[in-house]
């Protein structure tokens, strides 16, 4: 996270880390006791999901193997478009006022709103500096009208663009499918953006949630 | 320090395979996708692929489809390379680099491996 | 697929000269250009990204600019380590990546 500051301790109950044995890969959300939802460009064959500390390497936090993961049928490693995907968890996550489910949207938000980006992602780009600590910055929702004067045909309509006005604000490297969160509910997870991070007027793009909450609803149903 | 380093030069005959390896250290591997780019002699620069490192999520140039799998090891942060049914034209030097970005998306090469040649000849 | 041309393909200058080369993209691209330089016999090194922004440790007197189709590589006083061949390349639709057919800039 870029230009953002530590997270209210426990602020964030339903994130998680994406490990790659002790080493941070990916964000994402609990979504239930077995599912976590993260972006589609975090697959790998084995996780290790953290959950229910703000800090990375703390010993009371859950961890949790997950071997199985279902990317979005549409997910194109070439557009990045319908760029999410859900991890089942091996074991069942113990839910706790550290480990709560986060609400998915009802509704898509509209732009001007302003909502929560967070993650463990490096603060400093493009050298890196990961932080031990959950960082969050806030951003608004941008139109998708503003978003594509910047980034053109590569926005897709299932994208969602979020940033500040001449701002360094934004996501990094880290911070990939974690929580875009307005109004309490989830509206995105970081997907992509332009590098060096944190680029003034080059808004992060995250992953539509709220065009999505069928198929995350169905998907779990259908792996039960 | 932060670096990619290449097999060796290879010499080939016309239809056999070539397999050159990129071994990356001082950086996380899994976190950055790899691409390789190939330069015949006196020619310039031409795309064939890349290999997303956690993922194995691949792309490869529409001319060399069927012909080359790229791979990866992440036990040993080491990407490969694999070229089939070797030909003249193949002739070149091929360098694996970095692709710089966040998220889904890159954007350029930072880093580049120092080039293995690759010889087809009969 | 998007093709990148370069021109000149080749230039002679002299030490102290103001070099510039330019790469056309055959549809916008919008900023997503990139320059790097090759000397023989070794890898090719990122100069400028993003068309015009400068990579860590590149010296000052390389600057990059334009949008959309048409893009400039500004040497402003050619040094003599400056003399190889440099290339652009666009990352705005890919795959696949494509790059220009390079410019060599020789000593005149």
């Known amino acids: 996270i870029i230009d953002g500051a530590p997270c209210a301790r426990g602020s964030h109950p339903w994130q998680v880390a994406l490990l790659s044995g002790n080493q941070l890969h990916c964000g994402g959300v609990l979504v239930n006791e077995r599912w976590v939802l993260t972006a589609a460009h975090c697959k790998m064959n084995e996780y290790t999901v953290h959950l229910g500390s703000d800090t990375l390497g703390d010993r009371r936090a859950q961890r949790i193997k997950a071997s199985k993961s279902f990317r979005h049928p549409g997910y194109s490693t070439q557009t990045h478009v319908n760029d999410l995907m859900l991890v089942k968890l091996n074991s069942q996550a113990r839910l706790s006022s550290m480990v709560k489910k986060v609400r998915l949207p009802s509704r898509c938000e509209p732009p001007g709103t302003t909502c929560t980006v967070s993650g463990w992602g490096t603060t400093t780009s493009p050298d890196v500096t990961f932080p031990s600590d959950l960082m969050c910055v806030d951003v608004k929702l941008i139109s998708p009208q503003d978003c594509t004067k910047v980034y053109k045909d590569l926005l897709e309509n299932s994208m969602l663009c979020a940033g500040i006005p001449d701002s360094k604000k934004n996501a990094c490297n880290g911070d990939s499918g974690g929580p875009l969160v307005c109004r309490g509910t989830l509206q995105g997870l970081v997907s992509w953006g332009t590098f060096p991070c944190g680029q003034p007027n080059d808004p992060g793009v995250y992953t539509q949630v709220c065009k999505f909450t069928k198929w995350i609803n169905d998907t779990m149903k259908k792996h039960r | 320090q932060v670096q990619l380093v290449q097999s060796g030069a290879e010499v080939k005959k016309p239809g056999a395979s070539v397999k050159v390896s990129c071994k990356a250290s001082?950086?996380?591997?899994?976190?950055?996708?790899i691409h390789w780019v190939r330069q015949a002699p006196g020619q310039g620069l031409e795309w064939m692929g890349s290999?997303?490192?956690?993922?194995?999520?691949?792309n490869y140039a529409q001319k060399l489809q069927g012909r080359v799998t790229m791979t990866t090891d992440t036990s040993t942060s080491t990407a490969y390379m694999e070229l089939r049914s070797l030909r003249s034209d193949d002739t070149a030097v091929y360098y694996c680099?970095?692709?710089?970005?966040?998220?889904?998306?890159?954007?350029?090469?930072?880093?580049w491996g120092q080039g293995t040649m690759v010889t087809v000849s009969s | 697929d998007i093709q990148m041309t370069q021109s000149p393909s080749s230039l002679s200058a002299s030490v102290g000269d103001r070099v510039t080369i330019t790469c056309r993209a055959s549809?916008?691209?919008?900023?997503?250009l990139n320059w790097y330089q090759q000397k023989p016999g070794k890898a090719p090194k990122l100069l400028i990204y993003?068309?015009?922004s400068l990579q860590s440790g590149v010296p000052s007197r390389f600057s990059g600019s334009g949008s959309g189709t048409d893009f400039t590589l500004t040497i402003s006083s050619l040094q003599p380590e400056d003399f190889a061949t440099y290339y652009c390349?666009?990352?705005?639709?890919?795959?696949?990546?494509?790059f220009g057919g390079g410019t060599k800039v020789e000593i005149k």
């Open positions: 001082g950086y996380t591997f899994t976190s950055e996708g």
């Open positions: 290999i997303s490192a956690s993922s194995g999520d691949t």
């Open positions: 549809q916008s691209i919008s900023s997503y």
């Open positions: 390349d666009q990352w705005y639709s890919t795959p696949p990546i494509t």
């Open positions: 680099a970095r692709a710089a970005g966040y998220g889904a998306r890159h954007w350029y090469f930072d880093l």
């Open positions: 993003g068309a015009s």
